[in-house]
Amino acid sequence: IWELKKDVYVVELDWYPDAPGEMVVLTCDTPEEDGITWTLDQSSEVLGSGKTLTIQVKEFGDAGQYTCHKGGEVLSHSLLLLHKKEDGIWSTDILKDQKEPKNKTFLRCEAKNYSGRFTCWWLTTISTDLTFSVKSSRGSSDPQGVTCGAATLSAERVRGDNKEYEYSVECQEDSACPAAEESLPIEVMVDAVHKLKYENYTSSFFIRDIIKPDPPKNLQLKPLKNSRQVEVSWEYPDTWSTPHSYFSLTFCVQVQGKSKREKKDRVFTDKTSATVICRKNASISVRAQDRYYSSSWSEWASVPCS
Amino acid sequence: RNLPVATPDPGMFPCLHHSQNLLRAVSNMLQKARQTLEFYPCTSEEIDHEDITKDKTSTVEACLPLELTKNESCLNSRETSFITNGSCLASRKTSFMMALCLSSIYEDLKMYQVEFKTMNAKLLMDPKRQIFLDQNMLAVIDELMQALNFNSETVPQKSSLEEPDFYKTKIKLCILLHAFRIRAVTIDRVMSYLNAS
């Protein structure tokens, strides 16, 4: 058993049918010695008396808010949560496996640049009685500071019969140098509590590996005289690290017909312009990627050929 | 030690070309190592990230773009600093600053070259003959060093009398390749910056 926060405790259980559970001793936070009784949640049934209460915690029915009283007055509370260990592996019931980029990916994180700011998000089908708390650091043995905000509900989607809820959090490394070569990964820890169930999820990454630039901005077309060709031009996104000559991007320009089946023409360039043939009803899209370290491509920025 | 915006030497352009070749070569070598050594801990998540140039060279700091010298986080990791604020820049020859940066890159390349050659000698003794260093990568390191055109003492190749532990050697190869790829990215960024300046 360990303390999650004041008066909230997590009991770790080896979770299998007929498991013996864990013996837990609760102590009433009071100078009083006599006439103390204990109850669980809203029930008025007295579970025991005395300054301490010994309970065998086996299942969720044994978890909850234990309260010690004296003469109708509440003295203190202890909330017990359960953390299930199923065959040597901590349970992951609360969050959905996003399966990207690999199985058992519960937290996904992205950064728009090398400033040390990043966003993480996760999915769940649970809509109520759910709380999250997020901590982060650079490295684990001698951790350096990363400050995270509060997790917020950022999207709701309908997936078949189920509703899916997306939560996200923004974090900022306290003293980040965009040009630094990372040798210690960022660690992100999310505590999730659903009713009386506690779970924790972690992710470890280097900022360089989670970079995803914003799409190029100011995408424009300039028709070339006496030609079906157009000059496409664009600019680096505002959120990208500067100077751009140091933090350079490379670009992919795509000409896509109305039909998804039509052949796509693609050009790769380090410049912020390209000459392409603009077909009728086609659209031109451009996306960006770090020129020197192949992390994710940005989303496409698009303009119609007409 | 910071990189000011300067008129590049005509010699910068071949360096940019060579640095791009270097990044391509080390990335290919790393990919090959990860595939060949699939039963070894060779992914970025599994290895310890060590930098053999730590405390010996200071390429990131020496080659810092002028725009980042105002960022305290980019300066506080320096042990010794020639320039601690932008106002000193005017009184110093920009070519001196560039020379410091480029010599630091040269020293990096020299250290990695020695490590890779020593490692290759060990890998050639492996009866499994599982993996060797790409000669192209070694050649590209050499070409960039020549293009940088610094004279420095040649470091003797380390020789080891004891029987090599091939498992450890292959893990060290992965560690070295990951670190060298990150340094090659920095070198490429620097060359691109100098080229544009």
Partner: antibody, heavy 115, light 111 residues
Framework: QVQLVQSGGGVVQPGRSLRLSCAAS????????MHWVRQAPGKGLEWVAF????????YYADSVKGRFTISRDNSKNTLYLQMKSLRAEDTAVYYC????????WGQGTMVTVSS | SYVLTQPPSVSGTPGQRVTISCSGG????????VKWYQQLPGTAPKLLIY???QRPSGVPDRFSGSKSGTSASLAITGVQAEDEADYYC????????????FGTGTKVTVL
């Protein structure tokens, strides 16, 4: 004590369907994940499928994906395996099993796919 | 397709020490705990070892388990006639959990 009693096995022709049941008692069935495991005659153990305690997630071996469906009825304390498009290579003893460091197995039920 | 490899058979005389190996990889045994089962003819498997080296109550202490790196082993010290059975190791793979990964199985013969 924990008990898992299986039923529903038998002889079936290729291409036909069969449903296996596993009745649980002696524990809070709705709190635990459950597996199906099979063993072809003279062969080793092969995992078939898993279902979470609340039925929200199901996982299958590639060899049965798209043909077999694992399900549970927590109000009846029963686990099911619906087997469709059966093949000769599905012939085996099928076991249900609880998930956890200490597990409990059903007695097994024989499924024979033969024409 | 079994990812955990066991020797097909091992044998020993009563009182001898018999060991069975179970070889896997970094993503399964290297990352997860190992169980061992004993299966007597015509019966369901019986749990002998969980958590690499833990014995459930009721399992004789002549059975012991261990794990090192990407391999695990089961030892029977002082093998007895009633130990003649098939033995299976079981683990998980980090990418496919909760799918059970079984070993190929080992037939123990007591001579």
């Amino acid at each position: 004590q924990v008990q898992l009693v299986q039923s529903g096995g038998g002889v079936v022709q290729p291409g036909r369907s069969l449903r296996l049941s596993c009745a649980a008692s002696g524990f809070t069935f709705s709190s635990y994940g459950m597996h199906w495991v099979r063993q072809a005659p003279g062969k080793g153990l092969e995992w078939v499928a898993f279902i979470r305690y609340d039925g929200s997630n199901k996982y299958y071996a590639d060899s049965v994906k798209g043909r077999f469906t694992i399900s549970r009825d927590n109000s009846k304390n029963t686990l099911y395996l619906q087997m469709k498009s059966l093949r000769a290579e599905d012939t085996a003893v099928y076991y249900c099993k609880t998930h956890g460091s200490h597990d409990n197995w059903g007695q097994g039920t024989m499924v024979t796919v033969s024409s | 397709s079994y990812v955990l490899t066991q020797p097909p058979s091992v044998s020993g005389t009563p009182g001898q020490r018999v060991t069975i190996s179970c070889s896997g990889g970094r993503s399964n045994i290297g990352d997860n705990t190992v169980k061992w089962y004993q299966q007597l003819p015509g019966t369901a498997p019986k749990l002998l070892i969980y958590g690499n080296d833990q014995r459930p109550s009721g399992v004789p202490d002549r059975f012991s388990g261990s794990k090192s790196g990407t391999s695990a082993s089961l030892a029977i010290t002082g093998v007895q006639a009633e130990d003649e059975a098939d033995y299976y190791c079981q683990s998980y793979d980090r990418g496919t959990h909760p799918a059970l990964l079984f070993g190929t199985g080992t037939k123990v013969t007591v001579l």
